[in-house]
């Protein structure tokens, strides 16, 4: 899995989108999890409604929301009031039984609020490496990293 970078500004909201094949994943609940370390587990942050037929309803866990467009094939995660500690590697997952397929690997980067004049630096993200500079920008808030640039193994 390639990794897509989404950048957000501290204190603001960041929306992460994970496209998938609607028919392949029809009837499956989805989840957003945070990768704990290189070889660690992916810790569930929030999942779609327990009842799949209501998975289009927005579901919150703290400051993180998830909603699933099952026809369009897009899982959307909203991180509200983004903070430096939200930076890190995440996954969008499709759940089936006790298994989970990775839909997308996401690196969340948190940029300093330009209106915040404290000398806190302008970017926080974990595992900074030279390879980040080589990643191409997909659009204003996300870009893809080539496979292998993030040292975490795929868990699909």
């Amino acid at each position: 899995h390639n990794t897509t970078v989404f950048q957000g500004v501290a204190g603001q909201s960041l929306q992460v989108s994970c496209p998938y094949d609607s028919m392949k994943h029809w009837g499956r609940r989805k989840a957003w999890c945070r990768q704990l370390g290189e070889k660690g587990p992916c810790q569930r942050v929030v999942s779609t409604h327990n009842l799949w037929l209501l998975s289009f309803l927005r579901r919150w866990n703290g400051s993180t929301a998830i909603t699933d467009d099952t026809l369009g094939g897009t899982l959307t995660i909203t991180l509200r009031n983004l903070q430096p500690h939200d930076a890190g590697l995440y996954q969008c997952q499709s759940l089936h039984g006790s298994e989970a397929d990775t839909l997308r690997k996401v690196l969340v980067e948190v940029l300093a609020d330009p209106l915040d004049h404290r000398d806190a630096g302008d970017l926080w993200f974990p595992g900074e490496s030279e390879s980040f500079e080589d990643a191409h920008v997909e659009h204003s808030i996300s870009r893809s990293l080539l496979e292998g640039e993030i040292p975490f193994p795929p868990t699909s």
Epitope: W26, G27, L51, L53, D68, D69
Partner: antibody, heavy 118, light 107 residues
Framework: EVQLLESGGGLVQPGGSLRLSCAAS????????MSWVRQAPGKGLEWVSV????????YYADSVKGRFTISRDNSKNTLYLQMNSLRAEDTAVYYC???????????WGQGTLVTVSS | EIVMTQSPATLSVSPGERATLSCRAS??????LAWYQQKPGQAPRLLIY???TRATGIPARFSGSGSGTEFTLTISSLQSEDFAVYYC?????????FGGGTKVEIK
């Protein structure tokens, strides 16, 4: 109050074409997936096709794939079903239904009868 | 394609009596099941979703239960307006499919 009003049904010969319309009111049309569901005389319900709120995603039952086309005009709050190469087995009452992206049909129109016969 | 089997095909009940309708799925659908009511010459109406949640405006005499492959729709005390055909629908397998229906008629 949600209202769905189908039109365009009628008698058509095998191999012919027909376009059904469904005029919607009482809700934000562009926010909802819309489907066509049919019911052959004296038979049960069969889902036919669905289109997402934006119109960007469309899906069909295998029995109509390649012959029927679903579309919508959100500026006119109208859903369409273009039916080509009609067969006798397409004879049914066709209902338009407002639903969720998971194909739960919350509201139904009163239906329009399509008869395919020579 | 998931096959939904409803039984009985016809149920004869007296007004005021209890009616129990069954729906069986060929594979587990968890609780992702809906029930619809269709009166003669009318469009179907959503009654129950999520196997047991009544849709807006549906009287409390209608209740749904079950999960997995076996589901039941119960009408606790039949009113004259309840005589109709009832359909179950599964949602989590593509394509969505309906049962063949159960006709509830006056005994």
């Amino acid at each position: 109050e949600v209202q769905l009003l189908e039109s365009g049904g009628g008698l058509v010969q095998p191999g012919g074409s027909l376009r059904l319309s469904c005029a919607a009111s009482g809700f934000t049309f562009s926010s909802y997936a819309m489907s066509w569901v049919r019911q052959a005389p004296g038979k049960g319900l069969e889902w036919v096709s669905v289109i997402s709120g934006s119109g960007g995603s469309t899906y069909y039952a295998d029995s109509v794939k390649g012959r029927f086309t679903i579309s919508r005009d959100n500026s006119k709050n109208t859903l369409y079903l273009q039916m080509n190469s009609l067969r006798a087995e397409d004879t049914a009452v066709y209902y338009c239904a407002k639903g969720t992206p998971t194909l739960l049909f919350q509201h139904w129109g009163q239906g329009t009868l399509v008869t395919v016969s020579s | 394609e998931i096959v939904m089997t409803q039984s009985p095909a016809t149920l004869s009940v007296s007004p005021g009596e209890r009616a129990t309708l069954s729906c069986r799925a060929s594979q587990s659908v968890s609780s992702n099941l809906a029930w619809y009511q269709q009166k003669p010459g009318q469009a179907p109406r959503l009654l129950i979703y999520g196997a047991s949640t009544r849709a807006t405006g549906i009287p409390a005499r209608f209740s749904g239960s079950g999960s997995g492959t076996e589901f039941t729709l119960t009408i606790s005390s039949l009113q004259s307006e309840d005589f109709a055909v009832y359909y179950c629908q599964q949602l989590p397998y593509w394509p969505p499919t309906f049962g063949g229906g159960t006709k509830v008629e006056i005994k």
